[in-house]
Amino acid sequence: QGWQAFKNDATEIIPELGEYPEPPPELENNKTMNRAENGGRPPHHPFETKDVSEYSCRELHFTRYVTDGPCRSAKPVTELVCSGQCGPARLLPNAIGRGKWWRPSGPDFRCIPDRYRAQRVQLLCPGGEAPRARKVRLVASCKCKRLTRFHNQSELKDFGTEAARPQKGRKPRPRARSAKANQAELENAY
């Protein structure tokens, strides 16, 4: 498919307060949370608000014509291109207080297509050829999704759909929240 594209608009996907299982401490009115209630984090952990805009999964709206050989769509179609960063994990829905985000490195999330939509377009062809009907698959929305170690190389490159990740059979270490629970919650969030 050929591209004749120009950017129209951009939508940022930034986790809203309602998406968090626990609000960041400085957004919490009640400052008396204890460690147990706060997932082991100190009450005044420094969440920098500037991180939110630095790490946003953006939906860029592009308008393009669909082409098939010499034929071109009568009207342009508008679709989304997913762009931007999805870290750090503490800004992702359901990550706060559940993932082991105190570690120096952790789950890598990417801004990838979430939903697609099918759109039927009419292609006009030169030389008096009859118009053709084509169905195109367009990105409808974007989201942050974790790269898992069960992605293959090609999926990693285009950030394909996530495989369900079976848990490895290791004995859990004693923690306030088990490693398995953390992992399941993080992945089910997406």
Partner: antibody, heavy 119, light 110 residues
């Protein structure tokens, strides 16, 4: 100034114990997860252990599991590493390091304390 | 032998662009964020890049990180003599359940 200062290193015989300490200053201690990273002479970096904001959030490298214990005392702004059953291969420069950014690397480091295990 | 593989050495002349690679597996770089550290001779390591490509404040924009699949790389443009140091990549490994470092790359500025 953000500072981590390690102490407690020294020469010790195999099988003996040693306790390392790391004193923090210049930042809110409770805001940081803390780690021990070691570097054997002429070698690369090796992560030893890490502790989150409470004692339930702890990880160890397999090479030290069951022998080393990491702990922190937020009231004293201090991190500790209790090293038991020391081996010759534990000889290294031990760094205390911290991070306060989720999954954001170790952004604060001490200068290290040397542990030599030799008979 | 390190879980993450780096070339033992790299070199370049002042002003040049140098890239250091870091190869891992699906259980570390393939699924977790990558950090890079710089260790100048006789000093403690310093965080250079976090979360694959983010620079902490104070790190010049000559340093940049990237990641693709199970490999990561650190690029240094406009090489300067003070960049001569050891560089380490690191990532959490889900199978080993520990923070793994690469073996380090000694960068020499000719």
């Amino acid at each position: 100034e953000v500072q981590l200062v390690e102490s407690g290193g020294g020469l010790v015989q195999p099988g003996r114990s040693l306790r390392l300490s790391c004193a923090a200053s210049g930042f809110t201690f409770e805001d940081y997860a803390l780690h021990w990273v070691r570097q054997a002479p002429g070698k690369g970096l090796e992560w030893v252990s890490g502790i989150g904001w409470n004692d339930d959030e702890i990880d160890y490298a397999d090479s030290v599991k069951g022998r080393f214990t990491i702990s922190r005392d937020n009231s004293k702004n201090s991190l500790y590493l209790q090293m038991n059953s020391l081996r010759v291969e534990d000889t290294a420069l031990y760094y205390c390091a911290g991070n306060n950014r989720g999954y954001g690397g170790l952004d604060v480091w001490g200068q290290g304390t040397t542990v030599t295990v030799s008979s | 032998q390190s879980v993450l593989t780096q070339p033992p050495s790299a070199s370049g002349t002042p002003g040049q662009r140098v890239t250091i690679s870091c190869s891992g597996s699906s259980s570390n770089i393939g699924s977790n964020t990558v950090n890079w550290y710089q260790q100048l001779p006789g000093t403690a390591p310093k965080l250079l890049i976090y979360s694959n490509n983010q620079r902490p404040s104070g790190v010049p924009d000559r340093f940049s990180g990237s990641k693709s699949g199970t490999s990561a790389s650190l690029a240094i443009s406009g090489l300067q003599s003070e960049d001569e140091a050891d560089y380490y990549c690191a990532a959490w490994d889900d199978e080993l359940e520990l923070y793994v470092f690469g073996g380090g790359t000694k960068l020499t500025v000719l």
